[in-house]
Interface confidence: medium
């Protein structure tokens, strides 16, 4: 298991919410991506190959997410100060073999300007 800080902008704020970007290499065909808050699994998405050109995307812990050919974005809404924490992208690579797990993360700072429902 490889642990490290994300070497890219992991948090993108908009409209009182945050997009958490979890990247993976383009070569990866089948994988599971989990979003961890501290040690707690918030979201997951699994992509697997099926018959012919079919692909299966499944989530056991569902969050609004977006999949591209080299990243999974998880969206958290209605930010408040309790969202401030360490967030990790836990990537399990199934294909190509060998099986590998990588963990990258960063700290989500919450500032007044990013809160969803600021008191005026």
């Amino acid at each position: 298991e490889i642990n490290g800080s994300a070497n890219y902008e992991m948090f993108i704020f908009h409209n009182g919410g945050v997009q958490i970007l979890c990247k993976y290499p383009d070569i990866v065909q089948q994988f599971k991506m989990q979003l961890l808050k501290g040690g707690q699994i918030l979201c997951d998405l699994t992509k697997t190959k099926g018959s012919g050109n079919t692909v299966s995307i499944k989530s056991l812990k569902f969050c609004h997410s977006q999949l591209s050919n080299n990243s999974v974005s998880f969206f958290l809404y209605n930010l408040d100060r309790s969202h401030a924490n360490y967030y990790f992208c836990n990537l399990s690579i199934f294909d190509p073999p060998p099986f590998k797990v990588t963990l990258t993360g960063g700290y989500l700072h919450i500032y007044e300007s990013q809160l969803c429902c600021q008191l005026k």
């Epitope: 089948q30 699994t46 190959k49 099926g50 018959s51 079919t54 299966s56 294909d95 073999p97």
Partner: antibody, heavy 124, light 108 residues
């Protein structure tokens, strides 16, 4: 024990239609993609069509594209193959088969469980 | 589409002998997405090997697979009476999935 049981085969005239069904038991059906594979009498195996776990993605061999439709009903643990505009060359034993994910990972391989097959004969 | 060619077409051997079956692909099968199946008369195919070399659950260790790219082999170290059957290789890398024409292993 995983069991796949096909039904709906029979004799049909060229240009006719048939709907094959495959009922699965002993398995969490919606965990898996499924396929139809056929075998003409005395010949080899031919992959026909595949569908992912929730029916949201399908694929077909060129020989049946536009004529056959694969679908599934997870509530009924059932897989279907609607066959239209049938031709003599579609005569075969049709198997439903389950996609498999290797132990300890999701490394994909078809097909670890097969039905016993159902015969479709297209003849005038 | 990827065309698979199997050789020999028929292999006549005695129980206890070693069988080596070949499967050649018309283009590279990436990530070793190649499987082997055994089919006996009147029965559905049975998965033996996936990922070119991984044995499926319950398959005896006398069956082994090897190869990568375009050349793959299935070996049966000591033929048992129940091993006489037709063997198909199968690529599941590119759509449409394709099977080889089969190798029949029969008793000499």
């Amino acid at each position: 024990e995983v069991q796949l049981v096909e039904s709906g085969g029979g004799v049909v005239r060229p240009g006719g239609s048939l709907r094959l069904s495959c009922v699965a038991s002993g398995v969490t059906f919606d965990d898996y993609g499924m396929s139809w594979v056929r075998q003409a009498p005395g010949k080899g195996l031919e992959w026909v069509s595949g569908i992912n776990w929730n029916g949201g993605d399908t694929d077909y061999s060129d020989s049946v594209k536009g004529r056959f439709t694969i679908s599934r009903d997870n509530a009924k643990n059932s897989l279907y193959l609607q066959m239209n505009s049938l031709r003599a060359e579609d005569t075969a034993l049709y198997y439903c088969a389950r996609d498999f994910y290797g132990s300890g990972s999701y490394y994909h391989v078809p097909f670890d469980y097969w039905g016993q097959g159902i015969l479709v004969t297209v003849s005038s | 589409e990827i065309v698979l060619t199997q050789s020999p077409g028929t292999l006549s051997l005695s129980p206890g002998e070693r069988a080596t079956l070949s499967c050649r692909a018309s283009q590279s099968v990436s990530r070793s997405y190649l499987a082997w199946y055994q089919q006996k008369r009147g029965q559905a195919p049975r998965l033996l090997i996936y990922g070119a070399s991984s044995r499926a659950t319950g398959i005896p260790d006398r069956f082994s697979g090897d190869g990568s790219g375009t050349d793959f082999t299935l070996s049966i170290s000591r033929l048992e009476p129940e091993d006489f059957a037709v063997y198909y290789c199968h690529q599941y890398d590119m759509s449409p999935f394709t099977f080889g024409p089969g190798t029949k292993v029969d008793i000499k």
